[in-house]
């Protein structure tokens, strides 16, 4: 639902109460308040499911609930991407999908959700206590990541209820983008309101929906999200993570996606020429305007059969997720 601020109507100030600055200082806070309230907070959800048919096969499903356009999705295990996690798949809305063993099939379920099937056998197979994380890079919200794992007592075929992240954060990209402007605006608004505290306040005509109504609260993160924003990243080590995947690798240039073909190829392909392209080390989200995208995390370059490319499942677009439905 697109949330609209219900701003109380201002009565004309009484003569003598306001100076020349009056109108400006009164109007600006309400404009900023409107911006703050209408800036919907995105949410990422993760569901981990063990398949009943193959007891060590997992399906990870993640979705983005926000109003921005997705520029990259990264799925990792063993903890958040960039905090000890190992990348399983990277899905780019235009340039395709890259995945690494034991990931078997990554795909877009909708234009705002993805799924990933993990192979159940071999040294690199996951186990029940593995943590899986999904990171959605979007504009203008920045990067939002959620993690989930299978409950210890889960029966095969059952799944953990998909919930927003125990670990969830907005990366620098969002703060530097529009979110940054809004954040500054909100801080400035508080500053203005504080300054106004000792001045006579204008009479407010109550509106049908007060700013405290649940409707106006929709811009704030969910309680889980709010708590999660304060949770520092923890490196989660599990006995299921193959040690070989943690080896360092040469730093590649930021344009590693450029080598991905964009032609239609629905079937999984074998190792391609671009498969040996070094993947850059984790660390930065570079502005979408530069045509550079989130780094894929610390992974050695793979050239084995686990590497698959599917071209773009959706075009670049302004999303219509639940927090911004048209």
């Amino acid at each position: 639902m697109r949330t609209e601020a219900q701003v109380p109507a201002l009565q004309p100030p009484e003569p003598g109460l306001e100076g020349a600055m009056g109108h400006r200082t009164l109007v600006l806070p309400w404009v900023l308040l409107t911006l703050c309230v209408t800036a919907g907070t995105p949410e990422v959800w993760v569901q981990v499911r063990m398949e009943a048919t193959e007891l060590s096969s997992f399906t990870i499903r993640c979705g983005f609930l926000g109003s921005g356009s997705i520029s990259l999705v990264t799925v990792s295990w063993g903890g958040p991407n960039g905090a000890g996690g190992t990348t399983l798949a990277v899905l780019h809305p235009e340039r395709g999908i890259r995945q690494w063993a034991p990931a078997r099939q990554a795909r877009w379920e909708t234009q705002s959700s993805i799924s990933l099937i993990l192979e159940g056998s071999g040294a690199s197979s996951p186990c029940a206590n593995t943590t899986f994380c999904c990171k959605f890079a979007s504009f203008p919200e920045g990067s939002w990541e959620a993690c989930g794992s299978l409950p210890p007592s889960s029966d095969p075929g059952l799944s953990a209820p998909p919930t927003p992240a125990p670990i969830l954060r907005a990366d620098l990209a969002g703060i530097l983008g529009v979110s940054g402007v809004l954040l500054f605006g909100c801080v400035y608004l508080l500053h203005l309101l504080r300054r106004h505290k000792h001045r006579p306040a204008p009479r407010l005509q109550p509106s049908r929906t007060s700013p405290q109504a649940p409707r106006a609260r929709a811009w704030a993160p969910s309680q889980a999200s709010q708590a999660a924003l304060h949770v520092p990243y923890a490196t989660i080590n599990t006995s299921c993570r193959p040690a070989t995947l943690d080896t360092a690798h040469p730093h590649g240039g930021p344009s590693w996606w450029a080598s991905l073909p964009t032609h239609a190829a629905h079937r999984p392909q074998g190792p391609a020429a671009w498969a040996s392209t070094p993947i850059p080390a984790r660390g930065s989200f570079v502005s979408v305007e530069n045509g550079l995208y989130a780094q894929a995390g610390e992974r050695p370059p793979h050239t084995g059969p686990g590497l698959t490319l599917f071209p773009d499942p959706r075009g670049p677009r302004a999303m219509e997720g639940p927090l911004g439905v048209r």
Epitope: L65, T110, Q111, T262, A264, P313, R317
Partner: antibody, heavy 118, light 111 residues
Framework: QVQLQQSGAELAKPGASVKMSCKAS????????MHWVKQRPGQGLEWIGY????????EYNQKFKDKATLTADKSSSTAYMQLRSLTSEDSAVYYC???????????WGQGTLVTVSA | DIVLTQSPASLAVSLGQRATISCRAS??????????MHWYQQKPGQPPKLLIK???NLESGVPARFSGSGSGTDFTLNIHPVEEEDTATYYC?????????FGGGTKLEIK
Amino acid sequence: QVQLQQSGAELAKPGASVKMSCKASGYTFTSDWMHWVKQRPGQGLEWIGYINPSTGYTEYNQKFKDKATLTADKSSSTAYMQLRSLTSEDSAVYYCARGSSGSWFAYWGQGTLVTVSA
Amino acid sequence: DIVLTQSPASLAVSLGQRATISCRASQSVSTSSYSYMHWYQQKPGQPPKLLIKYASNLESGVPARFSGSGSGTDFTLNIHPVEEEDTATYYCQHSWEIPYTFGGGTKLEIK
């Protein structure tokens, strides 16, 4: 306003193929997926698959994987669906529908009736 | 595949009364915040029309007498008060995973 204009009714013989079209207007054709849905006379709705017109990427309902082929022409903002090896079971109305991020369908074509008869 | 079971298959409601249509999914199609379930109305000879998205979000232009609720596996479409023009078949649809599926439909008749 958004419009999806589908091609006219088709009468085909068993074993033949048909190709129907869905011309989009009123929005950026490459910005959303185009989905196809089947409805047999007096029956419910079945999702066939989608195509991303921007790249040609497709996903199919397994049931229709060997029956339908989805394509798109960006230059004419037209999506196509070809049905092959037709049988009487394929006699139905076929709709194209514009998807959105959550894959609900707010815009539908008027439907193309396919009749398979010897 | 996720199976959507709609009930009842048909329903006759008096003008001005409440019509309640149920849709049950064979597995959860919800996150903690949103449900990937949508409702459509279809009249004879016409394509379906979107009424509700994400279980409870009314599509623009759809009368407020239509409302949706539910999460997880159980969803409900309510129409109150029912009007003559609401005579149609109603379908639920999930978009939780591929393949998307529709319910079998509920035919609403106004008495």
